[in-house]
């Protein structure tokens, strides 16, 4: 029967009538002729995370798709031959009759493949997110443990102080906190976790043993130690923590005074005529996720913005920036700045006391969720996320959001690179007006407040637990200006990596070993990216992000500042201008010295490199008490470590709810760093059953100190 058609075979047959072999249905389409080139399809599985089932489904669809492509190619060939007047056999005719069906099936299969690939990507993303979340949770738990270790070491360290021992034995309100036996137990345990150097053991072996003891204590194991068990010891330590002894009044605390809290700041509506006032949010529990966060839009790719609306800056956002400016000091030595025309012209206020009062009023007024992030939280050496932010919302795995770090003023730049561990002293203090990255050439260089170092300090009454202010910036508006060219970009944020998109507020009243550094929260939500595109956006964000600062347009003298009052330990590092990628933009600024913080390898203290390089015996240099002028009582004295896992215990800083008095520094615009001065109340000696000369470096041996002028 004539089911044969013209054959392309090597046979000697010339073209003849079409073969009558009728092929049934669609099966005819599948074989004859050259296979159409199968279209390339993206790899169905992008990694081990893909589930086996999804792989199989995609494999089946892929195979089906190839077959259909092949079939369609054949049909196209048949059609072409028919058009040339060639005869097709029945099989081919049957196949051609199914052309539309094959085409439809092909489209359907492609759509199906797209859907399943999207689904597969979603699954992958979900798995990655879950893995990341689990990783973050592990890190958070790890960090909690680390925090607990630090608290424990702190307490054990303080127990070497006779006064502390006496206080704990006498107790508060006459109820003893620790008995003599319990103190002895802790002394014994102290020798295990902070042993004398045994030269017969390698250092890491010695600390390995110590770490096992610490671990078992954290676990509260029933194993025997020092004539008791780790569980009992843990209970003893927890009792010390819960006694709030280290929060008691003999320790100065950080935070604003009551009258400062009550004070209200004068309005600045006249400075930002177009901004609509937005009521400051009431103080909220620190565990809540902030409702308004400052979003630095330069941080996002320009292509993500479509809105052409004019950027609006709320009036109290500007106030907040002013406060931040007043908290940031910049040396006058910076290259002279040419004031650029801003909508807000900075004017140096005459009376330093008035300025300081205003700053304090502003700080007190703003009780919203201001996000403070200390430097140690910005140490991302292993590309890990800050565990303190896990509870807020896990980051989209594909968006590596860089976390900027606020720069420190340039000091001794010529020696900075060669001696990164040197701790320079700031000769003078100038303001660092923050350039807001808004469009329309608007730069929020607010009036600069130059609070003087007045010798009198306000008595500190019940300090507020958190100093928080909401920094609000509409996230749906377009940013016209990106960062500056390298030449004109003075001070930059050094960006960390892989920060989650959301973050809760972090208490400014932090542990002293995590010095505060106000940083705008770069974890605020950014305009969402289409889900299917997220995989392509791994590299969309720049590896380092630059936040510009304009130098102070007006030179404001500060003769009152005494050299000894400027012992700010900042360990700054002058990065070269090419250290960070620049985003081109039209925002012109006067050239300044480029200062940036590199990530330091000291994440758990203050990540400043402050206490490095000194002799171990020099620890006392960091323990002293400041004079009455600034009310700073150094060392660990000013915080209460809460050993128990409070609801906020995921946040390293929020453990220490009793604020510590950095007020002289905060109001005067210094970056407070962990300092211990010269006067520890007494070295740990005989009471610890140590024997031999007292060890001057009772605390954490791994902390190197550095002498500060």
């Amino acid at each position: 029967m004539p089911s044969a058609t013209s054959h392309s075979g090597s046979g000697s047959k010339s073209s003849g009538p079409p073969p009558p072999s009728g092929s049934s249905g669609s099966e005819a389409a599948a074989g004859a002729g050259a296979a159409a080139p199968a279209s390339q399809h993206p790899a169905t599985g992008t990694g081990a995370v893909q589930t086996e089932a999804m792989k199989q489904i995609l494999g089946v669809i892929d195979k089906k798709l190839r077959n259909l492509e092949k079939k369609k190619g054949k049909l196209d060939d048949y059609q072409e031959r028919m058009n040339k007047g060639e005869r097709l056999n029945q099989d081919q005719l049957d196949a051609v009759s199914k052309y539309q069906e094959v085409t439809n099936n092909l489209e359907f299969a492609k759509e199906l493949q797209r859907s399943f690939m999207a689904l597969s990507q979603d699954i992958q993303k979900t798995i990655k997110k879950t893995a990341r979340r689990e990783q973050l949770m592990r890190e958070e738990a790890e960090q909690k443990r680390l925090k607990t270790v630090l608290e424990l070491q702190y307490v054990l360290d303080k127990l070497g102080d006779d006064e502390v021992r006496t206080d704990l034995k006498q107790g508060l309100n006459g109820v003893p906190i620790l008995s003599e036996e319990e103190l002895s137990l802790l002394d014994e345990f102290y020798k295990l976790v902070d042993p004398e150097r045994d030269m017969s053991l390698r250092l890491n072996e010695q600390y390995e043993h110590a770490s096992i003891h610490l671990w078992d204590l954290l676990e509260g194991k029933e194993k025997p130690v020092c004539g008791t068990t780790y569980k009992v010891l843990k209970e003893i330590v927890e009792r010390v923590f819960q006694s709030n002894y280290f929060d008691s009044t003999h320790n100065h605390q950080n935070g604003l005074c009551e009258e400062e809290e009550a004070a209200s700041a004068p309005a600045v509506e006249d400075q930002v005529p177009e901004a609509e006032p937005e009521p400051a949010e009431e103080y909220t529990e620190q565990s809540e996720v902030e409702s308004t966060e400052y979003v630095n839009r330069q941080f996002m790719a320009e292509t993500q913005f479509t809105s052409g609306e004019k950027e609006q800056v709320d009036e109290w956002t500007v106030e907040t920036v002013e406060v931040v400016n007043s908290l940031q000091q910049q040396p006058q030595a910076a290259s002279p700045s040419v004031p650029e025309p801003h909508s807000l012209t900075p004017v140096a206020q005459a009376d330093p006391l008035v300025r300081r009062q205003r700053v304090q009023d502003l700080m007190a007024q703003m009780q919203g969720p201001y996000n403070f992030i200390q430097d140690s939280m910005l140490d991302f050496e292993n590309q890990t996320l800050d565990p303190a932010i896990v509870s807020a919302q896990p980051m989209n795995p594909t968006q590596n959001m860089d976390m900027p770090q606020l720069v420190c003023p340039p000091v001794h730049s010529e020696s900075r690179l060669a001696q990164p561990n040197q701790v320079p002293v700031q000769p003078e203090a100038t303001q660092v007006p923050l350039v807001s990255s808004t469009s329309e050439g608007y730069t929020a260089s607010q009036p600069l407040y130059q609070p003087s170092h007045a010798t009198e300090q306000r008595p500190q009454k019940e300090p507020i637990d958190q100093i928080q202010a909401t920094i609000s910036l509409n996230t749906d508006q377009t940013t016209a200006s990106s960062s500056l060219p390298a030449a004109s970009q003075p001070q930059v944020f050094q960006a960390g990596t892989s920060k989650p998109l959301h973050s809760s507020g972090i208490n400014v009243n932090a542990a002293p070993f995590q010095s505060m550094q106000t940083v705008f929260n770069m974890n605020a939500p950014v305009p969402p990216v289409n889900e299917p595109e997220t995989l392509k956006q791994q590299n969309q964000y720049q590896a380092s992000y630059n936040q510009s600062f304009s130098s102070q347009p007006h030179q404001v003298e500060q003769t009152e500042l005494q050299q000894e009052q400027l012992q700010t330990v900042v360990g700054t590092y002058h990065g070269s201008p090419d250290q960070s990628h620049q985003v081109t933009g039209n925002h012109q600024q006067p050239p300044q010295q480029n200062t940036g913080f590199p990530r330091s390898n000291q994440p758990y203290y203050n990540s400043r490199g402050v206490s490095r390089g000194g002799s171990r015996g020099a620890r006392g240099l960091m323990n002293g008490y400041r004079g009455p002028a600034n009310g700073f009582r150094g060392g660990y004295d000013g915080y209460r470590p809460s050993f128990s896992n409070t609801p906020n215990s995921g946040y390293t800083q929020s453990q220490f709810s009793a604020p510590r008095d950095y007020s002289g520094y905060q109001r005067d615009g210094y970056q407070q760093n962990f300092k211990r001065g010269s006067g520890q109340s007494g070295p740990r000696g005989a009471p610890r059953g140590r024997g031999g000369p007292p060890r001057p470096n009772r605390g954490m041996p791994q902390m190197n100190t550095q002498q500060v002028n």
């Epitope: 089911s3 013209s6 073209s15 072999s21 092929s23």
Partner: antibody
Framework: QVQLVESGGGLVKPGGSLRLSCAAS?????????MSWVRQAPGKGLEWIAY????????AYANWAKGRFTISRDNAKNSLYLQMNSLRAEDTAVYFC??????WGQGTLVTVSS | DIQMTQSPSSLSAAVGDRVTIKCQAS??????LAWYQQKPGKPPKRLIY???NLDSGVPSRFSGSGSGTDFTFTISSLQPEDIATYYC??????????????FGGGTKVEIK
């Protein structure tokens, strides 16, 4: 239901003629089909006779069938025909009509005998 | 006309055996070849078209291969229901020289 039903078979004397019909149902003769006739002598194999292309009426025959057998179709009646002349004893067989090479009728028996 | 030569004319195999039937065309017919199964008293049923394409509903133990002049039909594992006679057929057509849709002589498959 798509089917083919052959008819017109029977006993015929050698030298005689016979016209076989194949009625198609369930599909139209206006389509792109080759309609064929195939026969099978008792206990023997299949033997292709001829085909016609419904679309344009082009026909093809086996060499041995040329001149004696004629294939035709009536699209209006949805029917296929085989006109057999000068029948011989060796033409005794079951005659099948087929659409292409997939759909077959049950066949009709033609016996050529004196 | 084109001649189709099929071999063997009959074969006997055990259930589960692999059965192979050959078909040779007197001239090249590309891949225009079909294979049929016919059981006594029934019309033929096409199993393979275009030399190697399996018809829908046909068990996958049946397969075909070849092109040009030499073709092979295989039953990978003979089953009792496979007892039948198998035919090859040229399905080529051309406008000038008529190949004809000649059948092979058939191969009768039996179970041992």
């Amino acid at each position: 239901q798509v089917q083919l039903v052959e008819s017109g078979g029977g006993l015929v004397k050698p030298g005689g003629s016979l016209r076989l019909s194949c009625a198609a149902s369930g599909f139209s003769f206006s389509g792109s089909y080759y309609m064929s006739w195939v026969r099978q002598a008792p206990g023997k194999g299949l033997e292709w006779i001829a085909y016609i292309y419904i679309g344009d009426g082009v026909t093809a025959y086996a060499n041995w069938a040329k001149g004696r057998f004629t294939i035709s179709r009536d699209n209006a009646k949805n029917s296929l025909y085989l006109q057999m002349n000068s029948l011989r004893a060796e033409d005794t067989a079951v005659y099948f009509c087929a659409r292409g090479n997939r759909l077959w009728g049950q066949g009709t028996l033609v016996t050529v005998s004196s | 006309d084109i001649q189709m030569t099929q071999s063997p004319s009959s074969l006997s195999a055990a259930v589960g055996d692999r059965v192979t039937i050959k078909c040779q065309a007197s001239q090249s017919i590309s891949s225009y070849l079909a294979w049929y199964q016919q059981k006594p008293g029934k019309p033929p049923k096409r199993l393979i078209y275009d030399a190697s394409n399996l018809d829908s509903g046909v068990p996958s133990r049946f397969s075909g291969s070849g092109s040009g002049t030499d073709f092979t039909f295989t039953i990978s594992s003979l089953q009792p229901e496979d007892i039948a006679t198998y035919y090859c057929q040229c399905t080529a057509v051309s406008s000038a020289t008529i190949y004809g849709n000649a059948f092979g002589g058939g191969t009768k498959v039996e179970i041992k």
